[in-house]
């Protein structure tokens, strides 16, 4: 294992995670560890000199940066709150407050919204979409021949009972919010009033 700074033929250092090629001196030099930055660039005779990031700044990775990134607070106006503080080697970790969920744009959580568990009223059901989410439910009426009799975010419309399949007759027709009511057929020979 070569100790930086060292010269190399093909500009590819042995440990690319922790070393980098410095073209000005044609040598491989040490990167600075997380939490530090380059205070003095390496030369042919001296390796990189690193220093700890100043207060309220950080570098997350092995680097050869001349500065540290400024810590950014979590934006409480957008519904975020810090779950872990910014340290010299890690930016602040932000998360939506409990009871709030992320609104995503290009795979990034851009702001938080109150979770609204929409209740679909009797006669309607939640529209099925590809997204498996409890928020922003769109309620649609039951199809003809179907009913749904609860206020629920997940209940599905069910087909009306077909009385004849059970050997019964219809006493009251089904609606979008109630099932068909069936009754026993009249006895043979019974007098119809």
């Amino acid at each position: 294992q070569l100790v930086p700074p060292y010269r190399i033929e093909n500009q590819t250092c042995w440990d690319q995670d922790k070393e980098y090629y410095e073209p000005m001196h044609d040598v491989c030099c040490s990167r600075c560890p997380p939490g530090e930055f380059v205070f003095a660039v390496c030369s042919r005779s001296q390796d990189t000199v690193c220093k700890t990031c100043p207060h309220n700044s950080y570098n997350e990775h092995w680097n050869h940066l001349s500065t540290c990134q400024l810590c950014r607070p979590c934006d409480i106006v957008l519904g975020f709150e810090e779950v872990a503080p910014c340290t010299s080697d890690r930016k602040a970790e932000c998360r939506c407050q409990p009871g709030m969920s992320c609104v995503y744009l290009d795979n990034e959580c851009v702001h938080c919204e109150e979770e609204r568990l929409v209740l679909c009223q009797p006669g309607t059901e939640a529209e099925v979409t590809d997204e498996i989410m409890d928020t922003d439910v769109n309620c649609v009426p039951c199809k003809p021949g179907h009913f749904q009799n609860t206020s629920s975010p997940r209940a599905r419309c069910q087909p009306h009972t077909r009385c004849e399949i059970q050997g019964l007759v219809e006493a009251a027709p089904g609606t979008s919010y109630s099932d068909t009511i069936c009754k026993n057929p009249p006895e043979p020979g019974a007098m119809l009033l």
């Epitope: 607070p73 979590c74 709150e81 779950v83 872990a84 998360r95 409990p98």
Partner: antibody, heavy 115, light 107 residues
């Protein structure tokens, strides 16, 4: 350095009242949900109440709803818990905690409910 | 309310052992879970947040995993200072809830 210092605990009779306070320093108080967590002797941790950063939303565990009131003063960096109609089962160490993920904790103040 | 069920409630182990504690949520909580260590007479100390992120200054022998309803805290090689009680906590929704705790004792 984050510091949370609770005060106001003590001995109170059943049905009595007590006001706990938590003085916070070392962080931007107004940016964090603040919570009270309690621990009865020899028992586990129980979240009691929380208040949103701006103080506009408050949350309580079912057993204290209507009896306890949480409040905060962002100008003074203080968190309070007004406890009324105290019961024997409320006796515990009450600890102030920073953030909804409880990043930092105080040392707690003891509340004893006994006749 | 979201119930957090921790197991085992206690365990005996020796220095150097690999220790695993599990926590199950009664409904999905994404990764909104923290693990805490508490020693007698002391305030709890957070070890892990967001299910798997290690808090600053916490030894790397501690690790967390899981998402949804099932979560695990692992101590890869138990040290003398690790004998304590461990709690999980969900912060997906109010009321915030803790597991019942796992006491790690010396075998």
């Amino acid at each position: 350095e984050v510091q949370l210092v609770e005060s106001g605990g003590g001995l109170v009779q059943p049905g009595g009242s007590l006001r706990l306070s938590c003085a916070a320093s070392g962080f931007t108080f107004s940016s964090y949900t603040m919570n009270w967590v309690r621990q009865a002797p020899g028992k586990g941790l129980e979240w009691v109440s929380g208040v949103a950063p701006s103080g506009d939303r408050t949350y309580y565990t079912d057993s204290v709803k209507g009896r306890f009131t949480i409040s905060r003063d962002n100008a003074k960096n203080t968190l309070d818990l007004q406890m009324t109609s105290l019961r024997a089962e409320d006796a515990a160490i009450y600890i102030c905690a920073q953030g909804f993920a409880f990043t930092n904790w105080g040392q707690g103040t003891m509340v004893t409910v006994s006749s | 309310d979201i119930q957090m069920t921790q197991s085992p409630s206690s365990l005996s182990a020796s220095v150097g052992d690999r220790v695993t504690i599990t926590c199950r949520a009664s409904q999905g909580i994404s990764s909104a879970l923290a693990w805490f260590q508490q020693k007698p007479g002391k305030a709890p100390k957070r070890l892990i947040f967001d299910a798997s992120s290690l808090d600053s200054g916490v030894p790397s022998r501690f690790s967390g995993s899981g998402s949804g309803t099932d979560f695990t805290l692992t101590i890869s090689s138990l040290q003398p200072e690790d004998f304590a009680t461990y709690y999980c906590q969900q912060y997906n929704n109010y009321p915030l809830t803790f597991g019942g705790g796992t006491k790690v004792e010396m075998k």
